[in-house]
């Protein structure tokens, strides 16, 4: 078990803070919830603290919760490939470019680390080149989320990882908006981290609304499990 992994044996409080600017529309989001890495689960509630969110909530899911991939459940035979927990408590910087097909792009930079007993994800997001009547600024996405695989590989030069995946957002007319994600994570501290063999995270997400919440918000439940590396032969014959 890595030193960082020991921090994730119980239920951990999570705080998410985002400052965003998309085509000049500035906004802030605050999120709060809990994570349980034993089961690979997160439950979070996000509130737009500046009024109405100028982009659809589903376009921010990867920035919020795929940002705290340290809560992914890594099976016993894969624990030596869990970069995310090994970087804790000092944490990691997570940078992404997200290209929305036939539309604009988001660039994000986040610091994910422990502040006391709370896992904090502080994010800056800049979005450019979006069409005012497109699927994103035109709010044409359905309020739901598909399952995805998130592909991870080591980046030995930077002592971190590179990650890429394609998100499929459902559009109200029945079509799909694709969003290509290019991600890199580098540790904040200078302690040892685990550099993984190639594998993926399998994600399932459910979006809902709190019936008692009047502000623009999103409730998120997520279930994430690492996969893609089989037991070694020595494991099979134990």
């Amino acid at each position: 078990m890595s030193k960082g992994e020991e921090l994730f044996t119980g239920v951990v409080p999570i705080l998410v803070e985002l400052d965003g600017d998309v085509n000049g529309h500035k906004f802030s989001v605050s999120g709060e919830g809990e994570g349980d890495a034993t089961y690979g689960k997160l439950t979070l509630k996000f509130i737009c603290t500046t009024g109405k969110l100028p982009v659809p909530w589903p376009t921010l899911v990867t920035t919020f919760s795929y940002g705290v991939q340290c809560f992914s459940r890594y099976p016993d035979h894969m624990k030596q490939h869990d970069f995310f927990k090994s970087a804790m408590p000092e944490g990691y910087v997570q940078e992404r470019t997200i290209f929305f097909k036939d539309d604009g792009n988001y660039k994000t930079r986040a610091e994910v680390k422990f502040e006391g007993d709370t896992l904090v994800n502080r994010i800056e997001l800049k979005g450019i080149d979006f069409k005012e009547d497109g699927n994103i600024l035109g709010h044409k996405l359905e309020y739901n989320y598909n399952s995805h695989n998130v592909y991870i590989m080591a980046d030995k030069q930077k002592n971190g990882i590179k990650v890429n995946f394609k998100i499929r957002h459902n559009i109200e007319d029945g079509s799909v908006q694709l969003a290509d994600h290019y991600q890199q994570n580098t540790p904040i501290g200078d302690g040892p981290v685990l550099l993984p063999d190639n594998h993926y995270l399998s994600t399932q997400s459910a979006l809902s609304k709190d019936p008692n919440e009047k502000r623009d918000h999103m409730v998120l439940l997520e279930f994430v499990t690492a996969a893609g590396i089989t037991h070694g032969m020595d494991e099979l014959y134990k």
Epitope: G10, V11, E34, D36, A206, S208, P211, V219, L221, F223
Partner: nanobody, 122 residues
């Protein structure tokens, strides 16, 4: 569990003493023949806030007795479409509030009871 005529009432109870750690959320799910397991109601163990599936709102009431570590589901005005196996479940995490709890997937929960059959005849 049990059998009852349409319009009747039943009360389900579930002991939570076997859970490994005190749950943040407890819930009832149900599974009718040939259908997926769906959420019926959930209750936040610390605050007592409750959420229901649209199909049972106003008819079912979820409650807890923390002293006895027991979860209850009071089911009134039962309909034939309420026929299913009912499961008690719990999560270490707090509840996921939802306007319609039926849309919360089963993976929200960590621990599951064995299930009890409820049959409502017309």
């Amino acid at each position: 569990g049990g059998s009852v005529q349409a319009g009747g009432s039943l009360r389900l109870s579930c002991s939570a003493s076997g859970f490994a750690s005190s749950p943040g959320c407890m819930a009832w799910f149900r599974q009718a023949p040939g259908k997926e397991r769906e959420g019926v109601a959930e209750i936040a163990t610390r605050s007592g806030s409750a959420y229901y599936a649209d199909s049972v709102k106003g008819r079912f009431t979820i409650s807890q007795d923390n002293a006895k570590n027991t979860l209850y589901l009071q089911m009134n005005s039962l309909k034939p479409e309420d026929t299913a196996i009912y499961y008690c479940a719990a999560s270490r995490l707090r509840c996921t509030p939802a306007a319609d709890f039926s849309r919360i997937p089963a993976y929200a929960m960590d621990y599951w009871g064995k299930g009890t059959q409820v049959t409502v005849s017309s």
